[in-house]
């Protein structure tokens, strides 16, 4: 929102830590939808739907000393973006990831504004602000030429390849390491 | 030279299931993610999902959510698509397509489709 | 989901004829804009991805333009065998959705 009155809020980003996806402990080469409500998080028998969740998040905002009367309620977007498309290679000892399809991310979509009364103690004036908060989820490409720092938080089953690197044959008989089938929904 | 070949045309109930397979040759099966994209008698093009063949990984479009299957053969670089619960709304050709990439524009697209499968769903 | 929309549905045109078509993303989709030919009957075909990159052995008489949310094919001399449809289909946003198609006949 571009407003003068709009404020970020301290702290209002700082999610929790959203729990591991659970493990799915493939045993055929298969990948099954159980048709799980669209924003219900972490059910193992649909890991493989586009399921870039909507989680519902409460909160208070606070502002210094000052705290919202209410407590607001956003989303924070949560999940994987489809099955994993990195390819373990593996070339004598040296193993090395490359893609075999655009990387993805789950990020806000829309943003809502929505106004709050923060009450202050000792006997402060209480004080309206106006927050941004996340309405909409969706899984949006990211490029490689993305900064290496909005990586930071995925494990190596999404790091990318380095940059110009062309994607090599996949040496004969490699496979995919625990790592990849455990997240690859 | 690069291929997928798809199964025959089907004709099915309301309710009843169909598994439509595209076979892969001409390239390392396992090195690239299997789509399928559908198109309605005189419609356009609707893209379902894909499955990762090396790890058995899927993700279908929401549309489809709880009818779609995506399975994969690396014995037979075979890829199978189940859908279930038809409805005659679901009267289309099927394609499977792969996905080839450009490593200069980082850019994707589908590059090789097999030649389709039509599915006719009527009572 | 990204709605792409293409105009016109339909054009009839002389061989030799200038055919520009357009597509347009309901939301900013960067350069990911790929082109499909379909013939009756047969699998849609690469033309174009990446907005302006020609697949190897299309003829240069196609060429992609655009950024963002509005891109153009244009066929800069119609040849008897560009009587086809034409999809556009964006890769930057989950999932993905091609355009209506725009069938471009013989007048």
């Known amino acids: 929102f571009k407003n003068d009155a709009t404020e970020i809020i301290p702290g209002l980003r700082e999610y929790p830590e959203p729990p591991q996806e659970l493990e799915n402990n493939q045993t055929m080469n298969r990948a099954e939808n159980g048709g799980r409500p669209p924003h219900h998080p972490y059910d193992t028998k649909d890991v493989s739907e586009y399921s870039c969740r909507e989680l519902h998040y409460t909160r208070f905002v606070t502002d210094g000393p000052c705290r919202s009367a209410k407590p607001v309620t956003e989303l924070v977007c949560s999940g994987q973006c489809g099955p994993a498309r990195l390819l373990p290679n593996a070339i004598g000892r040296v193993k090395w990831w490359r893609p075999n399809g655009p990387d993805f991310r789950c990020i806000p979509d829309r943003y809502r504004a929505q106004r709050v009364q923060l009450l202050c103690p000792g006997g402060a004036a209480p004080r309206s602000r106006k927050v941004r908060l996340v309405a909409s989820c969706k899984c949006k490409r990211l490029t490689r030429f993305h900064n290496q720092s909005e990586l930071k938080d995925f494990g190596p089953e999404t790091a990318r390849p380095q940059k110009g690197r062309k994607p090599r044959p996949r040496a004969r008989g490699a496979k995919a390491n625990q790592a990849e089938l455990e997240n690859a929904y | 030279e690069v291929q997928l070949v798809q199964s025959g045309a089907e004709v099915k109930k309301p309710g009843a299931s169909v598994k439509v397979s595209c076979k892969a040759s001409g390239y390392t099966f396992t090195d690239y993610n299997m789509h399928w994209v559908r198109q309605a008698p005189g419609q356009g093009l609707e893209w379902m999902g894909e499955i990762n063949p090396n790890s058995g990984g899927a993700g279908y479009n929401q549309k489809f959510k709880g009818r779609v299957t995506m399975t994969t053969d690396t014995s037979t670089s075979t890829a199978y698509m189940e859908l279930r619960s038809l409805r005659s709304d679901d009267t289309a050709v099927y394609y499977c397509a792969r996905l080839g990439y450009d490593d200069i524009y980082d850019d994707w697209y589908f590059d090789v489709w097999g030649q389709g499968t039509t599915v006719t769903v009527s009572s | 989901d990204i709605q792409m929309t293409q105009s016109p549905s339909s054009l009839s045109a002389s061989v030799g004829d200038r055919v520009t078509i357009t597509c347009r993303a309901s939301?900013?989709?960067?350069?990911?804009l790929n082109w499909y030919q379909q013939k009756p009957g047969k699998a849609p075909k690469l033309l174009i991805y990446h907005t302006s990159r020609l697949l190897s052995g299309v003829p240069s008489r196609f060429s992609g333009s655009g950024s963002g949310t509005d891109f153009t094919l244009t066929i800069s001399s119609l040849q008897p065998e560009d009587f086809a449809t034409y999809y556009c289909?964006?890769?930057?946003?989950?999932?993905?959705?091609f355009g209506g198609g725009t069938k471009v006949e013989i007048k």
């Open positions: 289909q964006q890769g930057d946003t989950l999932p993905y959705t």
């Open positions: 939301q900013d989709i960067s350069n990911y």
